[in-house]
């Protein structure tokens, strides 16, 4: 069996979708003639070397665009970035590439994505909307960290 990424669509609890704008992912209310991104995700093949009970470690990319989500420090602040990267290249590496990995946890229909490189930091969108995706440590406050992930088959 050849492993391939799964495809999915994401929206938050306020029904905002992820859109690519100037190489940045932003969350906006769904409208007609809008093109939300399709997510590509694949589980890390080295799952046994990562923390257990934190969620399923996955690489997250944008389907068909050779762009992947990664976490890097800018100054002292972990930030979320889009990097030109083939998700399968990350998948095949001999070790987990932790800056590109997220622990995916599901509770009911809600999904969270926690940075493997920066434990305790989650992908989030500002409650205001129309803002870029960020990383946050503050759950359930000014930022939304719960997302609905629908797999596309």
């Amino acid at each position: 069996k050849i492993d391939t990424p799964q495809r999915g669509s994401i929206q938050d609890i306020n029904h905002r979708v992820w859109v690519l704008q100037d190489q940045t992912l932003i969350a906006v209310p769904r409208k007609d003639r809008m093109s939300p991104v399709t997510i590509a995700l694949i589980s890390c093949r080295h799952v046994e070397t990562l923390e257990k009970d934190r969620g399923n470690p996955i690489y997250l990319g944008l389907n068909g665009l050779n762009l992947c989500l990664m976490c890097a420090k800018v100054g002292d602040q972990p930030t979320l970035q889009l990097k030109e990267k083939d998700i399968m290249d990350l998948y095949n590496q001999p070790e987990p590439v932790k800056s590109f990995l997220f622990y995916h946890s599901q509770s009911g229909r809600n999904s969270t994505f926690e940075s493997v490189a920066f434990p305790g930091w989650f992908i989030a969108v500002s409650s205001e909307g129309g803002c870029p995706l960020i990383l946050t440590q503050e759950l359930g406050k000014a930022n939304t960290t719960d997302f609905g992930l629908t797999m596309l088959f």
């Epitope: 046994e48 070397t49 990562l50 001999p94 070790e95 987990p96 932790k98």
Partner: antibody, heavy 121, light 109 residues
Framework: QVQLVQSGAEVKKPGASVKVSCKAS????????IHWVRQAPGQGLEWIGR????????RYDPKFQGRATITTDTSTSTVYLEFSSLRSEDTAVYYC??????????????WGQGTLVTVSS | QAVVTQEPSLTVSPGGTVTLTCRSS?????????ANWVQEKPGQLFAGLIG???DRAPGVPARFSGSLLGGKAALTLSGAQPEDEAIYFC?????????FGGGTKLTVL
């Protein structure tokens, strides 16, 4: 600058254990993987195993599983290799090395100076 | 477990080109083996040269290049310098462990 500094030479008797240390500086060991490799006299390099210092998970060459134990103390940025049930053929220089992801790939980029372990009765 | 074999020794003239190879007993070396090349100079620490078959490590001169050649990993040195005299080791990845070769002693003469 990036440095891996290892502990000094050891002489052990067959059946004994040895614990070698590797102290990292110039980088955060939680951001990399630290490997242990050895070189017996006149031989090539032999991979022993590695640790992810951030999590503590390890991998070993099947040949050394059970005799080698790699641990870390992130508070002092030190990684340890403990080798048990020593035999004369374990006489070698033991190296720690950093496996670091840069750009698109992993590199064994920085190495310690090596620790000579001599096993002799 | 695979055995990784390298030429024991090679000689190159200053300014010349030489190719070192790394063979696996388990079959053709591919990009999935993520070949690494490491240099050991007398009295110096080991230093990483190549990762992922053909990626140069930061600061490594462009005269060093990695590739796949006839089912083997290869390290080519173009325009050899006297300071390139060293032992070169390759390492190959096999799904859950690394295997190093025996090393090639390169003489620049």
């Amino acid at each position: 600058q990036v440095q891996l500094v290892q502990s000094g030479a050891e002489v052990k008797k067959p059946g004994a254990s040895v614990k070698v240390s590797c102290k990292a500086s110039g980088f955060n060991i939680k951001d990399t993987y630290i490997h242990w490799v050895r070189q017996a006299p006149g031989q090539g390099l032999e991979w022993i195993g590695r640790i992810d210092p951030a999590i503590g998970t390890t991998r070993y060459d099947p040949k050394f599983q059970g005799r080698a134990t790699i641990t870390t103390d992130t508070s002092t940025s030190t990684v340890y290799l403990e080798f048990s049930s020593l035999r004369s053929e374990d006489t070698a220089v033991y190296y720690c090395a950093r496996l670091h992801y840069f750009g698109n790939n992993f590199f064994f980029d920085y190495w310690g100076q090596g620790t000579l372990v001599t096993v002799s009765s | 477990q695979a055995v990784v074999t390298q030429e024991p020794s090679l000689t190159v003239s200053p300014g010349g080109t030489v190719t070192l190879t790394c063979r696996s007993s388990s079959g053709a070396v591919t990009t999935s083996n993520y070949a690494n090349w490491v240099q050991e100079k007398p009295g110096q620490l080991f230093a990483g040269l190549i990762g992922g078959t053909n990626d140069r490590a930061p600061g490594v001169p462009a005269r060093f290049s990695g590739s796949l050649l006839g089912g083997k990993a290869a390290l080519t040195l173009s325009g050899a310098q006297p300071e390139d005299e060293a032992i070169y080791f390759c390492a190959l990845w096999f799904s859950n462990h690394w295997v190093f070769g025996g090393g090639t002693k390169l003489t620049v003469l």
